[in-house]
C-alpha cells in the first residue's frame, strides 16, 4: 500500500508548487523502510556496493560538473543548476567559460578554471580550508571540499557569492540520491537537508540512509555487521 | 576607511639603494586575499608595476626588474617595505603603493604617492 | 608579457559627448582586464574590474564591455571631473600590466 500526502512547497525557482510525496507503508504497521534501514535491517546497499547506487551517483556527479549558478536577476536568491533549468531572461547564468575563470592559484595567474561557479562557495573566498600550496583545489566542482571558513567580507563582488543561496544537497529516498533543493521541499520530502554544503558531491546521501555507524570511506558501504543485527 | 601613504627619500644618487615604505590603515594585511603592492609612474608615462606581498607573505615581482627588487612587510605595524638597490636615472618617478586582492588581482586603494628622483 | 594597446592616445571632447576609449591585448586575456582613471596630479582610481563589472562608488556613466583581445571603456556624457588619463591594466598572467593610457582632455 501506497501513503500520498500532497502539499504546496516552496520549489527552486522560488515558487510555491504542489508536490506529492509517495510513502510505501509498512504491511505490518511498523516503522516505514527508512526507519528499519537505520536500525539496522539487511539492506544490501549498505552492505556492499550496489551497481545500480553507483551508476546513479556517478551520472548525478557528471551533470554537476557541468552545473553552474542561477542568479535571479530580481536579486531573490541563486541556485546550482543546468544551463537548461535556468531562465535566459529572468537569471543570470554563472559559468566560468572561454577564460572567465579565476586563476587556479596566484602563483599561475595564467592557468584559468573552467569548472564552476558554485553558489555560496569559491577558491578565492574560502579560508578553511583555503585553496594554495599543496592543497589548491581541482579543477572539478565535483572535487571541491565544503568551505568550513568564509573570507570575512559581506560582499565580494561576485554575483555566485553574494546572492540568497535558495538550495543546498538534499539526500532522498532509500537510494541515497541527492539534489539541491529547498529545505522545505527536502523536509516534506521527508529528506536529509546538508546546510554545510553546497554541492551534491560533497555529501555521501548513502551514508545518511544507512545510520549505524559511518562508512570507512564514505564512499564504500562496509556495514557487514548488519548481517547479525536483523 | 582605506588609506595608504606613501614616504620615500626624495632624492638620491645612481648606483644608491632605494628605500620606500608603504604605511595604511583600515585593513590588515593578515586579511585572507588581500596584498600591498608597488606601481610606479615615471612623469607623464604609463603606469608599471613592481612588485606584491600578501597575507601569507607570498611576493611577486615584476621579473625585469626582480633582481633589485625587495619587498617585505611589517604586520603588526601596517608597513610595507620596498627596496631597489643599484639606482638609475631611469628610476626617477613617483612610486604608488596600492592594495590587491586576489578576488581579481585589480588595485582597488592607491596612496597618493611619493616623488624620488634619481640625480648625479 | 602582455601588452596593452590604448587608443585613441588623446581624446579631446566636450562635458556631454559620449566617448569610447579602447584596450587591446597582445593575446587572448579572457575577461581579466580593469580599467583606471587618474586626474590631473591624484593617484588611479579603480573604475572597472573583471572588463565589465561596476566599482561602488562610481558614476553610472562609466561602464566596460568586451573580452579577449578588445575591451572598451564607455563615458556616457563626460562631464568636467571626468578629464585626465585612462589606463587598463590585465590580470590574465604575471607580471601584471598596464596599457600606455588614453588622455581625455577638454576640446
Known amino acids: 500500500a501506497q501513503h500520498v500526502t500532497t502539499q504546496l512547497v516552496l520549489r527552486n525557482k522560488g515558487v510555491y508548487e504542489s508536490v506529492k510525496y509517495i510513502q510505501q507503508e509498512n504491511f505490518w504497521i511498523g516503522p516505514s523502510s527508512i526507519d528499519l534501514i537505520h536500525l539496522g535491517a539487511k539492506f544490501s546497499p549498505c552492505i556492499r556496493k550496489d551497481q545500480q547506487i553507483e551508476q546513479l551517483v556517478l551520472r548525478e556527479r557528471d551533470l554537476e560538473r557541468d552545473s553552474g549558478c542561477c542568479v535571479q536577476n530580481d536579486h531573490s536568491g541563486c541556485i546550482q543548476t543546468q544551463r537548461k533549468d535556468c531562465s535566459e531572461t529572468l537569471a543570470t547564468f554563472v559559468k566560468w567559460q572561454d577564460d572567465t575563470g579565476p586563476p587556479m592559484d596566484k602563483s599561475d595567474l595564467g592557468q584559468k578554471r573552467t569548472s564552476g561557479a558554485v553558489c555560496h562557495q569559491d577558491p578565492r573566498t574560502c579560508e578553511e580550508p583555503a585553496s594554495s600550496g599543496a592543497h589548491i583545489w581541482p579543477d572539478d566542482i565535483t572535487k571541491w571540499p565544503i568551505c568550513t571558513e568564509q573570507a570575512k567580507s559581506n560582499r565580494t563582488g561576485f554575483l555566485h557569492m553574494d546572492c540568497q543561496i535558495k538550495g543546498r544537497p538534499c539526500c532522498i529516498s532509500t537510494k541515497g540520491s541527492c539534489e539541491i533543493t529547498t529545505r522545505e521541499y527536502c523536509e516534506f520530502m521527508h529528506g536529509y537537508f546538508h546546510e554545510e554544503a553546497t554541492l551534491c558531491s560533497q555529501v555521501h546521501c548513502l551514508d545518511k540512509v544507512c545510520g549505524l555507524l559511518p562508512f570507512l570511506n564514505p564512499e564504500v558501504p562496509d556495514q557487514f555487521y548488519r548481517l547479525w543485527l536483523s | 576607511q582605506v588609506t595608504l601613504k606613501e614616504s620615500g627619500p626624495g632624492i638620491l644618487q645612481p648606483s644608491q639603494t632605494l628605500s620606500l615604505t608603504c604605511s595604511f590603515s583600515?585593513?590588515?594585511?593578515?586579511?585572507?586575499?588581500?596584498?600591498v603592492g608597488w606601481i610606479r609612474q615615471p612623469s607623464g608615462r604609463g603606469l608599471e608595476w613592481l612588485a606584491h606581498?600578501?597575507?601569507?607573505?607570498?611576493?611577486y615581482y615584476n621579473p625585469a626588474l626582480k633582481s633589485r627588487l625587495t619587498i617585505s612587510k611589517d604586520t603588526s605595524k601596517n608597513h610595507v617595505f620596498l627596496k631597489i638597490a643599484n639606482v638609475d636615472t631611469a628610476d626617477t618617478a613617483t612610486y604608488y603603493c596600492?592594495?590587491?586582492?586576489?578576488?581579481?588581482?585589480?588595485?582597488?586603494?592607491w596612496g597618493q604617492g611619493t616623488s624620488v628622483t634619481v640625480s648625479s | 608579457d602582455i601588452v596593452l594597446s590604448q587608443s585613441p592616445a588623446t581624446l579631446s571632447v566636450t562635458p556631454g559627448d559620449s566617448v569610447s576609449l579602447f584596450c587591446r591585448a597582445s593575446?587572448?586575456?579572457?575577461?581579466?582586464l580593469h580599467w583606471y582613471q587618474q586626474e590631473s596630479h591624484a593617484s588611479p582610481r579603480l573604475l572597472i574590474k573583471?572588463?565589465?563589472q561596476s566599482i561602488s562608488g562610481i558614476p553610472s556613466r562609466f561602464s566596460g564591455s568586451g573580452s579577449g583581445t578588445d575591451f572598451t571603456l564607455s563615458i556616457n556624457s563626460v562631464e568636467t571631473e571626468d578629464f585626465g588619463m585612462y589606463f587598463c591594466?590585465?590580470?590574465?598572467?604575471?607580471?601584471?600590466?598596464f596599457g600606455a593610457g588614453t588622455k581625455l582632455e577638454l576640446k
Open positions: 591594466q590585465q590580470s590574465y598572467n604575471w607580471p601584471l600590466t
Open positions: 606581498i600578501w597575507w601569507d607573505d607570498d611576493k
Open positions: 593575446q587572448s586575456i579572457g575577461n581579466h
Open positions: 596600492a592594495r590587491i586582492t586576489t578576488y581579481y588581482y585589480g588595485m582597488d586603494y
Open positions: 583600515g585593513f590588515s594585511l593578515s586579511t585572507f586575499a588581500l596584498g
Open positions: 573583471y572588463a565589465s
